[in-house]
């Protein structure tokens, strides 16, 4: 009996540009001999419901119809059939499917393949055009995919150390898409300085589908009126 | 769906070249190997080559020496050239595509090339 | 060269019958073969793909079966459009190579 196993689950998820690595394993009950063997990998994109070859191994041809596209023949021996794809594109989303004969039987898999883009988030602060003791910071996040994403912004006081949330005098901005299909946001703040505690931590929290931990973005209020910090560093895919 | 039309002269002279040209519609040339195949007149099939780019080929050994494909992709075209024919290379030219596991999934209806003088 | 040699080279068949064509290849190909029925005047066409897949849109009363050297078409239930010739080819090695034809004759 053959069986061909992907993904748990049925999607992985891949950070753009990243060498993604696609899964597929062959479990055979006998010893596989790469010379009555074969993989064909293909790909249906998201938009256009046309399936399209990738990758072809069998007999003695081996071709990458997607530069760079291999399955490494010495892995496929011992049954690993996975595709790795440099270099990674948005528009490499879709789904996969991964078909294999060992002479004389078949059998595939298929998996969903996200491709994210984590966003780099910065803080800003727009005085132009305020009023007196009246500041405007911006929270901008640039570069990511999908288009989805989560700001909010959120204070700690010395009198309450845990995080409130900001609802008030919030605006955040319509997305825009980047030319290589990311998307930007900016999310923007109004403060009355003379009416907030010196030393109050302000936060901007971003959440994406790309992030394991949200993107914090902090300033402090000091009798200077205000203190803006580094980003976060956060874990991201890898 | 894929269709593909070959063109080329019907009567070619001994010693000249046999050119022909396989035009694809509903498809992208650049997704598949594209094969041209001959079948003399009450005979067998042939495979004289295939194409995928210009660096990628491999050609019948018997007919190397004389064979040439090209594509090109702005066109979504491929184009098989023969030189120094004789008699013996007058037979019904076909493209196919190239599908799965090698085989040939899609056919041009042929075109007959005669040489002769 | 793989050499791929088919049997019998014509036959003989009424409509209902059950045909069987073989197709040997002069050393192991695997399952990298393929089957084409051509009718005259016209181009080949693709029935059979990895010795055993049915190209879609080919009825289900053609059938292939074989790995490595030996290979065969079925047709159950001939059909008065079944009349043509068969082919196999190769996919194994360079060059591809195919069988000389099998005939399916109306009786």
């Known amino acids: 009996d053959l069986k061909v196993e992907m993904m748990a689950g049925g999607t992985q998820i891949t950070p753009l540009n990243d060498n993604v690595t696609i899964f597929c394993n062959i479990f055979y009950s006998q010893p596989l001999n790469i010379t009555s063997m074969g993989i064909t990998w293909f790909w249906k994109s998201l938009t256009f419901d046309k399936e399209v070859k990738v990758f072809e191994f069998f007999g003695d041809h081996q071709e990458a119809f997607r530069p760079g596209a291999i399955v490494s023949p010495w892995r496929l021996k011992s049954g690993d059939a996975s595709l790795r794809l440099p270099g990674i594109q948005l528009e490499e989303a879709g789904e996969y499917r991964c078909e294999v004969v060992v002479t004389p039987l078949k059998a595939q898999g298929t998996v969903q393949l996200e491709v994210v883009a984590s966003p780099a988030s910065r803080l800003l602060l727009d005085q132009v055009g305020m009023k007196e003791n009246e500041d405007k910071y911006m929270c901008e996040s640039s570069g990511f995919y999908p288009e989805a994403i989560n700001i909010t912004w959120e204070k700690q006081t010395q009198k309450f150390p845990h995080p409130i949330e900001i609802s008030e005098d919030v605006i955040t901005g319509p997305t825009i898409k980047n030319m290589d299909g990311t998307f930007n946001v900016t999310s923007c703040l109004k403060l009355n300085s003379s009416q907030e505690d010196p030393g109050t931590v302000y936060q901007c929290v971003v959440r994406h589908a790309s992030l394991h931990t949200p993107l914090r973005s902090n300033f402090t209020l000091t009798a200077a009126r205000h203190s803006l910090s580094e980003t976060e560093k956060t874990d991201n895919f890898s | 769906q894929v269709h593909l039309q070959e063109s080329g002269p019907g009567l070619v002279k001994p010693s000249e070249t046999l050119s022909l040209t396989c035009t694809v519609s509903?498809?992208?040339?650049?997704?598949?190997?594209w094969s041209w195949i001959r079948q003399p007149a009450g005979k067998g099939l042939e495979w004289i080559g295939h194409?995928?780019?210009?660096?990628?080929?491999n050609y019948n050994p018997s007919l190397k020496s004389r064979v040439i494909m090209s594509v090109d992709t702005s066109k979504n075209q491929f184009s098989l050239n023969l030189s120094s024919v004789t008699a013996a290379d007058t037979a019904v030219y076909y493209c196919?595509?190239?599908?799965?596991?090698?085989?040939?999934?899609?056919w041009g209806q042929g075109t007959l090339v005669t040489v002769s003088s | 060269d793989i050499q791929m040699t088919q049997s019998p080279s014509s036959v003989s068949a009424s409509v209902g019958d059950r045909v069987t064509i073989t197709c040997r290849a002069s050393?192991?190909?695997?399952?990298?073969l393929a089957w084409y029925q051509q009718k005259p005047g016209k181009a080949p066409k693709l029935l059979i793909y990895?010795?055993?897949s049915l190209q879609r849109g080919v009825p289900s009363r053609f059938s292939g079966s074989g790995s490595g050297t030996d290979f065969t078409l079925t047709i159950s239930n001939l059909q008065p459009e079944d009349f043509a010739t068969y082919y196999c080819?190769?996919?194994?090695?360079?060059?591809?190579?195919f069988g000389q034809g099998t005939k399916v004759e109306i009786k």
């Open positions: 080819q190769q996919a194994n090695s360079f060059p591809r190579t």
């Open positions: 050393q192991g190909i695997s399952s990298w």
């Open positions: 196919a595509r190239v599908g799965n596991w090698g085989s040939h999934d899609a």
């Open positions: 194409i995928y780019t210009s660096e990628k080929n």
């Open positions: 990895v010795a055993s």
């Open positions: 509903g498809d992208s040339i650049s997704s598949y190997y």
